[in-house]
Interface confidence: medium
């Protein structure tokens, strides 16, 4: 049998059964999540569940820019350092940078400091680029 690789919407990139869209727009975390959802297909801000997935995403984004952090779908909605993925994925893989998690920082970004391979927490009302993800 011929197994067809699923196709992503135009402009989105495919990796291991998921489609990703990197949006070079400045949005706060909740507006970014709403915009991801608006593209349909069950898209949300991206969950990153393995080092391989993180590396593929980081390589893709580095082709566009290397200086601006990017919102992902990890947040702390209860503000108790109980982080969860907005798409419901299990919070098992972690890639936090060594920075303090304190203050009013309850949303996660891919940090440009380590080529987008590590995460930092940031204030959710900051306006940043964002990464969406869906399963085709």
């Amino acid at each position: 049998d011929i197994i067809m690789r699923p196709s992503c919407a135009p402009g989105w990139f495919y990796h291991k059964s998921n489609c990703y869209g990197y949006f070079r727009k400045l949005r706060n975390w909740s507006d970014a999540e709403l915009e991801c959802q608006s593209y349909g297909n069950g898209a949300h801000l991206a969950s990153i569940l393995s080092l391989k997935e993180a590396s593929t995403i980081a390589e893709y984004i580095s082709g566009y820019q290397r200086s601006q952090p990017i919102w992902i779908g990890l947040h702390d909605p209860q503000k108790r350092q109980q982080w969860q993925w907005i798409d419901g994925a299990m919070y098992l893989y972690r890639s936090w940078s060594g920075k303090s998690m304190g203050g009013n920082k309850h949303c996660a970004e891919m940090s440009s400091n380590n080529n987008f391979l590590t995460w930092s927490s940031n204030e959710c009302n900051k306006r940043q680029h964002f990464l969406c993800k869906y399963r085709p």
């Epitope: 402009g11 869209g21 949006f23 070079r24 727009k25 400045l26 200086s67 306006r127």
Partner: antibody, heavy 124, light 110 residues
Framework: EVQLLESGGGLVQPGGSLRLSCAAS????????MSWVRQAPGKGLEWVSA????????YYADSVKGRFTISRDNSKNTLYLQMNSLRAEDTAVYYC?????????????????WGKGTMVTVSS | QTVVIQEPSFSVSPGGTVTLTCGLS?????????PSWYQQTPGQAPRTLIY???TRSSGVPDRFSGSILGNKAALTITGAQADDESDYYC??????????FGGGTKLTVL
């Protein structure tokens, strides 16, 4: 090649009216927002007005609001600026500029191509 | 009324480096203002140099670069040349379809 050519400038008395035109070529005119920017003699640049690609949304600087009207005719690839109740302080070179706004993937918000300008003089 | 502030004039030696800045009368400039920079020589239309803080427009030499320095947008010219002598304007997008130009910086290459 993108080209923007302004016309319609000239000498007008205070309180008078003038309509500027900007003929665009080399790109799909209706796909781009457009703007007018002016420069008084010996002074800096000042943003005046902008209009969406469809013409449905318009924006104005406070200094011209209620006196100037921006419009476009996409079938003629032409941008307009209707200027009423002109004042001496409206004397300037008026530039037409293509405006990069939002796409699905990216926000821009800058002026990427400029015309050579047309001079408007308001004097009695 | 938001005022965008630039140095009125600046001079640089040929081959030298100069950084022009663009600030706000109240508050800090960040990438969320989408700073852009334009070069204008006397009697000519402006030319787009930098947009989205740090992206060079096509055909602009890489000696021109944009950044955020502290609470201002900045345009740095590395290895200044005689024909860089011009007026330089920054523009900030305030949102809701409103753009504000700075007063411009007259750059002299001595």
């Amino acid at each position: 090649e993108v080209q923007l050519l302004e016309s319609g400038g000239g000498l007008v008395q205070p309180g008078g009216s003038l309509r500027l035109s900007c003929a665009a070529s080399g790109f799909t005119f209706s796909s781009y927002a457009m703007s007018w920017v002016r420069q008084a003699p010996g002074k800096g640049l000042e943003w005046v007005s902008a209009i969406s690609g469809s013409g449905g949304t318009t924006y104005y600087a406070d200094s011209v609001k209620g006196r100037f009207t921006i419009s476009r005719d996409n079938s003629k690839n032409t941008l307009y600026l209707q200027m009423n109740s002109l004042r001496a302080e409206d004397t300037a070179v008026y530039y037409c500029a293509r405006l990069r706004g939002s796409t699905r993937w990216e926000d821009f918000y800058y002026f990427d191509y400029w015309g050579k300008g047309t001079m408007v003089t308001v004097s009695s | 009324q938001t005022v965008v502030i630039q140095e009125p004039s600046f001079s640089v030696s040929p081959g030298g480096t100069v950084t022009l800045t663009c600030g706000l009368s109240s508050g800090s400039v960040s990438t969320t203002y989408y700073p852009s920079w334009y070069q204008q020589t006397p009697g000519q239309a402006p030319r787009t140099l930098i947009y989205n803080t740090n992206t060079r427009s096509s055909g602009v030499p890489d000696r021109f670069s944009g950044s955020i320095l502290g609470n201002k947008a900045a345009l740095t010219i590395t290895g200044a040349q005689a024909d860089d002598e011009s007026d330089y304007y920054c523009v900030l997008y305030l949102g809701s379809g409103i753009w504000v130009f700075g007063g411009g910086t007259k750059l002299t290459v001595l």
